[in-house]
């Protein structure tokens, strides 16, 4: 369960793939499309608001008051729109919705280092946001060794 309704912190950042392709968002026919593309040299990167929430992992751990806690994130590129996991279609979509957000909008944060992260579906453990055919998709990761697979790694940057 999400520990609090309010995020513990928020962070505005551009999102790019491990191979430095940008994640961009375009309004088309009153809905947003998500693209993975190379930007031209001085082209401005789209920003995403990452909201960090604490989530208690269902476990019997206790002790230092933080055991079993995970960081959940929601990603919003524009007001009232959030990235959602569509587990049936193995796709990542932008949906307009009101708070409280559905579980499909929450992703467990993993990181290889401060600015290199992965997003695991709250609704489908072991499934991560990844890059497939120049689009974002949901990708099943079989073991922790595969967490370093480049197609599920993303970089966060302020620029």
């Amino acid at each position: 369960s999400i520990t609090g309704i309010s995020p513990i912190t928020e962070y505005l950042a551009s999102l790019s793939t491990y191979n430095d392709q940008s994640i961009t968002f375009a309004l088309e026919d009153e809905s947003y499309e998500i693209y993975v593309e190379d930007l031209k040299k001085d082209e401005k990167k789209d920003k995403v608001l990452l909201s960090y929430y604490e989530s208690q992992h269902p476990s019997n751990e206790s002790g230092d008051g933080v055991d079993g806690k995970m960081l959940m994130v929601t990603l919003s590129p524009t007001k009232d729109f959030w990235l959602h996991a569509n587990n049936k279609e193995h796709s990542v979509e932008l949906h307009k919705c009101e708070k409280p957000l559905p579980d499909q909008a929450f992703f467990v944060l993993h990181n290889m280092h401060s600015n290199c992260v992965s997003f695991e579906c709250k609704t489908d453990p072991g499934v991560f946001i990844g890059v497939k055919d120049n689009h974002l998709a949901l990708i099943k990761v079989d073991s922790s060794e595969n967490l370093c697979t480049e197609n599920i790694l993303f970089k966060l940057s302020e620029t």
Partner: antibody
């Protein structure tokens, strides 16, 4: 109750090696990043090394790169710091710490009591 | 590399005083900042994480604030048991501690 117990410190001559161990209990060890932080006598804290939860990614302070190696054994709930080519400036209390959250390198949620390493001839 | 600068180095205040410790980063660290308390002869302890979140079991007289490069730890009413050295710590890019602020009772 969370516990981190560091061992392996002691007096060692410059150029020699030492291996520190940190045995963890009271939490799901394999879900957390682990760290070594040191503190020279009367000085501030200095981050030394980090290892992610599956051991596949390691990071080091520039001054210890190539000399120190962090590793972990998730089956035995233990993190290690192998210290080679020790120098007098490595003299410090070495603390083991666990991450604050599953899977992420943000914050040191809990610290051990430390083990003193003295490098002197 | 990100440098963290704390001020003052030593702070002397009376019991009950409101005390403010400062920490400045050489670059924007996006609120990826903690405060640790270390009493003499003890291991450090996490007080505040992500700039303003109070760790479980820490008294509510401690609070954190800030953004960008400038961060503050406030003790609203200093108590004798708060005598310690306080370290800020950033994890936005790598891991770096400030040099510490020693808090004493006048």
């Amino acid at each position: 109750e969370v516990q981190l117990v560091e061992t392996g410190g002691g007096l060692v001559q410059p150029g020699r090696s030492l291996k520190l161990s940190c045995v963890a209990s009271g939490f799901t060890f394999s879900n957390y990043w682990m760290y070594w932080i040191r503190q020279a006598p009367g000085m501030g804290l200095e981050w030394v090394s980090s290892i992610n939860n599956d051991g596949g990614n390691t990071y080091y302070l520039d001054s210890v790169k190539g000399r120190f190696t962090i590793s972990r054994n998730n089956a035995e709930n233990t993190v290690y710091l192998q210290m080679n080519s020790l120098r007098s400036e490595d003299t410090a209390t070495y603390y083991c710490a666990k991450g604050h959250y599953y899977y992420t390198s943000y914050s040191f949620g809990y610290w051990g009591q430390g083990t003193l390493v003295t490098v002197s001839s | 590399d990100i440098q963290m600068t704390q001020s003052p180095s030593v702070l002397s205040a009376s019991v009950g005083d409101r005390v403010t410790l400062s920490c400045k980063a050489s670059h924007n660290i996006n609120k990826h900042l903690d405060w640790y308390q270390q009493k003499v002869g003890e291991a450090p302890k996490l007080l505040i994480y992500f700039t303003n979140n109070l760790q479980t079991g820490i008294p509510s007289r401690f609070s954190g604030s800030g953004s960008g490069t400038d961060y503050t730890l406030t003790i609203s009413s200093l108590q004798p048991e708060d005598v310690a050295t306080y370290f800020c710590f950033q994890y936005n890019s790598g891991w770096t501690f400030g040099q510490g602020t020693k808090v004493e009772i006048k």
